[in-house]
């Protein structure tokens, strides 16, 4: 009978190991080992045994020992199991985004590795085991499905092998492959909120704002902001799971007519779009035209309005008959008209809104200069040393300039407060003079002695 | 000045129908004329406006369900394309034109409205 | 979009008590507000234009007040005729898409 030691053993690939072949009989005819691994005997050996050191060991194998006794001829294997860690561990790559709510795939390769019933796979959140299972085929395949939650962005997965050879070896092995991060989103299937204008008028401002709730992570979320074929270059405030872009926009008269708004929130590899239309319109204030805007008293003027062609509008609160953009009314001018105002108010409905323009315009009638017994009384009659103020007063437009003379020198303090003396008595000519002529009116001032009382 | 809608009858679902509104005392080519309506024990609801040139506006829900049009200076048509069960309302005309002689500006204003006419959609 | 918002729904009043109903607009409809209202059968009747202006044969303890964004209908020394459902409306649009009246305010006089 021949007799291996030991019987089984473990080994590192490429490792080494002693054998012994020993035969029953004190003095067997032959005894060896038939092996097909570099073996070299190391003597001195006993007279039943021998002992071979086998290197190199790349697979596994099972050197046989044979002897040849009187009573016969036998053999005996040893079963060597080469054990090697995997070459290549290796994680799929992961989406770039992983919606929440659906759930992900995590594969994981592995080549290599030895022997196969001690290799195990697992995949990993961190440190937190997701699964295990037994590494099968070449290269070995492991996949496992998991949900994913707001809760697993950042987070870092991982594949690792453990080839576990224990009792026979004290030790486990373990390789883990490079770790993936995984970055999930969250994006509504509620569009954006679109606040805008729905009529713009041309050269002026108006304000956008789009806003979108319930995003994560709202600071990886883009916003895309167009009015027609101009970018707006929005201001974004972020929120707990909210953003609101607030753009400013200003509209040319080339793009007068419909446009649409269009609000854009990107996040992972997804878009929400709202659209809207926006009505640009160009509506100059209307134009007040009067005949002349200076005109004598008596003159007739025209005073007409005139506004964009779809506008209707209003002449100091009279709208145009029939309804439209020009309205006009004759007037003959008195100096009551003089600063007054003529008001066209001009209305405009744009896309079913209704906006509104005013101008005003002033005329000015030219009148005078004018001196009324009403304004300058031609006689006055007051006490000695009483105390007066003698009034008279000019009209006319332009104003006209007034002065009352006695004798040509003696001029009367107008609008002044005096003491009345004798030398005030006489009869002044009081003249109002103008670019557009003059006037004189007598005035008799009559002082009253206190000796006549 | 008046305003009268007629057309309303009881009609089975899916056969358009054709409410007519007629005004007197002034024209349309001066005013916007608004249809609106009101279904049992519910409140008005704005259905369009014609303006005085023939443009016309629809609130979101009426858009492609209604077509308003001028047929002549004193009627206007409101077809409902396809009727259905939730069509059953009176169907009221309105004029929805004024204007502010203080500031000088046209606004919508309804001050004016027919009697109503009762639609019913019933299979 | 004005959105018109109206409050309360209903309100109970007794006979010659104050009534005060409100009406929100989402945005500024300067004083391009009128209020109606309507009896049941018949058509709407307008009361009150550009927010405070009394309509033509209405009577004066209807009061309309507010301008921009908020706009109140006063209704004092309420009568038995004054039940009915009353609605506000915006003058100030009728773009596509657009919300006209308010949700209504049905007065009910004890």
């Known amino acids: 009978q021949t007799s291996v030691f030991p019987p089984e053993v473990i080994l590192p690939r490429g490792g080494s190991v002693k054998v012994n072949c020993s035969a029953s009989c004190d003095q067997p005819i032959s005894l060896g080992m038939e092996t097909p691994l570099p073996k070299k005997e190391i003597l001195p050996g006993g007279n039943n045994w021998k002992m071979y050191e086998l290197s190199n060991v790349q697979e596994d194998s099972q050197p046989m020992c044979y002897s040849n006794c009187p009573d016969g001829q036998s053999s005996a294997k040893t079963l060597l199991t080469v054990y090697w860690t995997p070459e290549r561990v290796e994680l799929a790559p992961l989406p770039p985004w992983q919606p929440v709510g659906k759930n992900l795939t995590l594969r994981c390769q592995v080549e290599g590795g030895a022997p196969r019933a001690n290799l195990t796979v697992m995949l990993l959140r961190g440190e937190k085991e997701l699964s295990r299972q037994s590494a099968v085929g070449e290269p070995a395949e492991v996949t496992t499905t998991v949900p994913v939650g707001r809760d697993d962005h950042g987070a870092n997965f991982s594949c690792r092998t453990e080839l576990d050879l224990r009792p026979y070896v004290l030790k486990l092995f373990e390789n883990t492959s490079a770790p993936h991060q995984l970055q999930t989103f969250d994006l509504p299937a509620t569009p954006p909120q679109l606040v805008s204008p729905q009529v713009l008028e041309v050269d002026t401002q108006g304000t956008v704002v789009c806003s979108l709730d319930g995003l994560f992570p709202v600071s990886e979320a883009q916003v895309s902001l167009a009015l027609g074929d101009q970018k707006l270059n929005p201001t974004i405030t972020y929120g707990n799971n909210s953003l609101s872009a607030k753009a400013s926009v200003k509209v040319t008269a080339e793009e007068e007519g419909t446009q649409q708004l269009l609000c854009g929130v990107m996040l992972g590899n997804q878009t929400q779009e709202t659209r809207q239309t926006v009505t640009i319109y160009s509506f100059p204030a209307p134009n007040v035209n009067l005949t002349k805007p200076e005109v004598s008293e008596g003159t007739e003027v025209i005073v007409e309005c005139e506004a964009h062609p779809r506008a209707k509008v209003m002449l100091n609160g009279v709208p145009a008959q029939p309804p439209g953009p020009r309205a006009q009314f004759l007037l003959k001018a008195t100096p009551e008209d003089n600063g007054r105002s003529f008001s066209c108010s001009a209305t405009l409905e744009v896309a079913g809104q209704l906006v509104h323009k005013n101008q005003t315009r002033e005329l000015r009638v030219l009148y005078g200069p004018r001196l009324d017994e009403k304004d300058c009384p031609g006689n006055w009659t007051w006490p000695e040393n009483s105390q007066q103020t003698p009034m008279c007063q000019a009209w006319g437009n332009p104003l006209p300039q007034l002065k009352c003379l006695k004798d040509g020198t003696f001029p009367l303090p107008i609008g002044q407060s005096v003491t009345v003396t004798r030398d005030l008595e006489g009869t002044y000519l009081c003249q109002a003079r103008s670019t557009r002529g003059e006037v004189t009116r007598e005035v008799t001032v009559n002082v009253l002695s206190p000796r006549y009382e | 000045q008046s305003v009268e809608e007629s057309g309303g009858r009881l009609v089975t679902p899916g056969t358009p129908l054709t409410l007519t509104c007629t005004v007197s005392g002034f024209s349309l080519s001066d005013y916007y004329m608004s249809w609106v309506r009101q279904a049992p024990g519910k409140g008005l609801e704005w259905i369009g406006i014609i303006s005085d040139s023939g443009s016309t506006y629809y609130a979101s829900w009426a858009k492609g369900r209604f077509t308003i049009s001028k047929t002549s200076s004193t009627t206007v048509d409101l077809k409902i394309t396809s009727p259905t069960t939730e069509d059953t309302a009176t169907y009221f005309c309105?004029?929805?034109?004024?204007?502010?002689?203080?500031?000088?500006?046209?606004?919508?204003?309804?001050?004016?409205w027919g009697p109503g006419t009762l639609v019913t959609v019933s299979a | 979009a004005y959105d018109m918002t109206q409050t309360p729904a209903s309100v109970e009043v007794a006979v010659g008590g104050t009534v005060t109903i409100k009406c929100q607009a989402s945005q500024s409809i300067n004083s391009w507000l009128s209020w109606f209202h309507q009896k049941p059968g018949q058509p709407p009747k307008r009361l009150i234009y550009k927010a405070s202006t009394l309509a033509s044969g209405v009577s004066s303890r209807f009061k309309g007040s507010g301008s921009g964004t908020q706009f109140t209908l006063t209704i004092s020394g309420v009568e038995s005729a004054d039940a009915a459902t009353y609605y506000c409306?915006?003058?100030?649009?009728?773009?596509?898409?657009?919300?006209?009246f308010g949700g209504g305010t049905e007065v009910v006089v004890k």
């Open positions: 409306q915006q003058g100030y649009s009728r773009s596509d898409g657009e919300h006209v």
């Open positions: 309105a004029r929805d034109w004024s204007y502010d002689s203080s500031s000088g500006y046209y606004y919508y204003d309804m001050d004016l």
